[in-house]
Amino acid sequence: RAVPGGSSPAWTQCQQLSQKLCTLAWSAHPLVGHMDLREEGDEETTNDVPHIQCGDGCDPQGLRDNSQFCLQRIHQGLIFYEKLLGSDIFTGEPSLLPDSPVGQLHASLLGLSQLLQPEGHHWETQQIPSLSPSQPWQRLLLRFKILRSLQAFVAVAARVFAHGAATLSP
């Protein structure tokens, strides 16, 4: 079973959307605030971001055997980042620059997560962040850290979907 209900995901669609996510995540990275980062020290808020690891079944063999595990892991990560991008880290001050693609990035995360989990099907969503409000002076650094880890996450997800589209599509 690949997704809840036993059907395979639309690998090609997922591949296209995950590639778009990669582009958006990279283009969003420098466009997250009003000024350069300065005295803001290290923050712990991004320590618990989800990573795709060896045991998650996202290797070619794991995807062949049962892509469910890997896709669930990717889905959890997408939801995690979607919540972060909707938090006051991004919706609060400093306002995003007018040409920031963070809004598009947010919508695309939601779109891909919905492709992986069609309506009526439910995976457990672990690791959803319950964030306490962030101080405005912390937010620029947090945005940079979140987008940097999101870049890494979507890069792996894009490779998974590229492999799936090439070898697992019906």
Epitope: M35, G86, T91, E93, P94, S95, L131, P133, P136, W137
Partner: antibody, heavy 115, light 107 residues
Framework: EVQLQQSGPELVKPGASVKMSCKAS????????MHWVKQKPGQGLEWIGY????????KYNEKFKGKATLTSDKSSSTAYMELSSLTSEDSAVYYC????????WGQGTLVTVSA | DIVMTQSPATLSVTPGDRVSLSCRAS??????LHWYQQRSHESPRLLIK???QSISGIPSRFSGSGSGSDFTLTINSVEPEDVGVYYC?????????FGSGTKLEIK
């Protein structure tokens, strides 16, 4: 064009509650936090708190915890503030404002607490 | 809480004058300082954000400077419509706090 339209003036009795609204238009409501600010007649500005309409997360000034409750309705792009157990000290103009570093404020709602 | 102290409390000026309004924070707020103008019976209007950044639609005679804990709003050539109260605001950390205001009057 971004607009924040606040509800009309309220005359309320001591001990009662009042709920005012701030209807947003011209932008995606969930993009941005909404602040609420109090201004007593002839006095300065005081921050009450903010709501993030995307996830209904709130942050309050400790001084207003238990006095003000911030909510929002995504379907109508409206933010609300309810003030409870009103006293004469709550007589003021209340403003909503979208993010400090953007030039968008509502026109204010005058609340008068009087027996 | 960060206390914002504005001076002078009142400023009486002649049209064409160059005036400076001062704002001091009780601790460093980097450049997270915003300036507002409030005319009688109107909502506050954002004049300057992040200490020195201009706002679209605000006349160029308004400028801001400073960083850390000392900030200045300068009006290069005062116009009669500039009368009102000017507030500085800590946008750095919770709770957000405003100065008590400087009232600008025209002689």
């Amino acid at each position: 064009e971004v607009q924040l339209q606040q509800s009309g003036p309220e005359l309320v009795k001591p001990g009662a509650s009042v709920k005012m609204s701030c209807k947003a238009s011209g932008y995606t409501f969930t993009c941005c936090i909404m602040h609420w600010v109090k201004q007593k007649p002839g006095q300065g500005l005081e921050w009450i708190g903010y709501i993030n309409p995307y996830n209904d997360g709130t942050k309050y000034n400790e001084k207003f915890k238990g006095k003000a409750t911030l909510t929002s309705d995504k379907s109508s792009s409206t933010a609300y503030m309810e003030l409870s157990s009103l006293t004469s000290e709550d007589s003021a103009v209340y403003y909503c404002a979208r993010r400090w570093d953007e030039a968008y404020w509502g026109q204010g709602t005058l609340v008068t607490v009087s027996a | 809480d960060i206390v914002m102290t504005q001076s002078p409390a009142t400023l009486s000026v002649t049209p064409g004058d160059r005036v400076s309004l001062s704002c001091r924070a009780s601790q460093s707020i980097s450049d997270y300082l915003h300036w507002y103008q409030q005319r009688s019976h109107e909502s506050p209007r954002l004049l300057i954000k992040y200490a020195s950044q201009s706002i679209s639609g605000i006349p160029s005679r308004f400028s801001g400077s400073g960083s850390g804990s000392d900030f200045t709003l300068t009006i290069n050539s005062v116009e009669p419509e500039d009368v009102g109260v000017y507030y500085c605001q800590n946008g750095h950390s919770f709770p957000f706090t405003f100065g008590s205001g400087t009232k600008l009057e025209i002689k």
